[in-house]
């Protein structure tokens, strides 16, 4: 029950996280015009990964896409790539995790297969979350660097009479959405990995040893470790006293009525 809950919760948390990563990637407010200690303008600038926008006091908002690919900063391209990789991995992870969910029955899928799929999706979520966090952090670092550079050169102009105020940009809402979403995806991935361990616990089978009544030599057949979910596996240790000391292990696995909810 705890395993199912952990897996289900991991899936939901990851789903929310990936939805957040997608939202952050699409959002226009990755960087917003810094309003602190600046002249108050009737124009508000903000930028995303795909376009830059201007909102005027009149209420008019105008957005222009970055129609060039080669002319964009390498860092911006890197952030785009990280976010897209995060989304793709997350989407595949979600798809895999749906089939891995213990509460969903798909044919006669073994629990060991579900465990593997849960682990795979968990790893995918972790990498997806890390990609998003890395992408957002790279962009944030780029903003901080540019902010201090533009602060140093805030007023440029000839002779100091005519001044051009450089627009400084600070963290936009998308960065916070991205960080939170990346974190959630990461947590969801960890939960899936934990659930995987619960789905496939290591089980030691202690084999039965039978002794001949006459006290003759004992034949011991060691049993190895057998991975099992504990559901639907019927382990029978038959002790046969036929005058010789031997063990016969018969492990049969077949679906029981308790296999799936």
């Amino acid at each position: 029950m705890a395993v199912t809950a952990c897996q289900g919760l991991g899936f939901v948390v990851s789903l929310i996280g990936i939805a957040g990563i997608i939202a952050a990637t699409c959002m226009d407010q990755w960087s917003t015009q810094d309003l602190y200690n600046n002249p108050v303008t009737a124009v508000f600038n903000y930028q995303g990964l795909w376009r830059s926008c201007v909102r005027e006091s009149s209420g008019f908002t105008e957005c222009r896409g970055y129609f060039t690919l080669l002319g964009l900063p390498a860092m911006l391209q890197a952030v785009r790539a990280l976010m897209i990789v995060g989304i793709v991995l997350g989407a595949i992870g979600l798809l895999v995790s749906i089939f891995a969910l213990k509460c969903i029955r798909i044919g006669s899928m073994e629990d060991s297969a579900k465990a593997n799929m849960t682990l795979t999706s968990g790893i995918m979520f972790i990498v997806s979350g890390l990609c998003a966090i890395a992408g957002v952090s790279v962009f944030a670092n780029m903003l901080v660097t540019n902010f201090w550079m533009s602060t140093a050169n805030m007023y440029t102009g000839m002779g100091g009479m005519v001044q051009t105020v450089q627009t400084r940009y600070t963290f936009g809402a998308a960065l916070f959405v991205g960080w939170v979403a990346g974190g959630l995806t990461l947590i969801g991935g960890v939960m899936m990995c934990i659930a995987c361990r619960g789905l496939a616990p290591e089980e030691t089978n202690y084999k039965a040893v039978s002794y001949h009544a006459s006290g003759h030599s004992v034949a011991y057949k060691p049993g190895g470790f057998k991975a099992s979910t504990g559901f639907g596996s019927n382990t029978k240790n038959k002790k046969i006293y036929d005058g010789g000391a031997r063990t016969e292990d018969e492990v049969q696995s077949y679906p029981s009525k308790h296999d799936y909810v």
């Epitope: 303008t41 005027e56 006091s57």
Partner: antibody
Amino acid sequence: EVMLVESGGGLVKPGGSLKLSCAASGFTFSSYTMSWVRQTPEKRLEWVATIIGGYGNTYYVDSVKGRFTISRDSAKNTLYLQMISLRSEDTALYYCTRLGQTQRNAMDYWGQGTSVTVSS
Amino acid sequence: DILMTQSPSSLSVSAGEKVTMSCKSSQSLLNSGNQKNYLAWYQQKPGQPPKLLIYGASTRESGVPDRFTGSGSGTDFTLTISSVQAEDLAVYYCQNDYYYPFTFGAGTKLEL
């Protein structure tokens, strides 16, 4: 047709109060940014205050901050300018204006104005 | 506050003449985000409220005759009337639409 009609002007003593109104018609009032602009007897134009459409943020020229309040009643399609602690330098013709949504913050429509005289 | 300086303060012209008036701002009115200039030109005839002629430094408001042309960028702007008509006799104001407080120039009076 867009119409802006100001009212409420008049003669007032220094330190007195006055409330100007601007009745708007012919456009979706609530979504437009509105401003008050005054013209002094010397014919100089001075922007007084702005209220942002939708958001309701307000901006004022330094000389009227704390004395003038711009507000709007979208149900009545009316813009207001509450003026207190009036001074002689507030004497002017007060225009109600609309900021055009595609005009780069320029004022595309102006009312005929209402006259405010502050004198003892 | 942004200082808007208009020159000349008055212009005597004859009908059909080409007229140019200047407006300078103490800070750039060019927005880096969209590369647009936030400057407007208004025309005010006696006894009337100002009328918008040009916005965004160079875009004519609808209904404005094409003899009116706005140009310039950053801090230096110009309004040109290619062939002055009698009905163009008025005071012309430039306005900063970029920074609060919005500020107007003192005006250029066009007279015969």
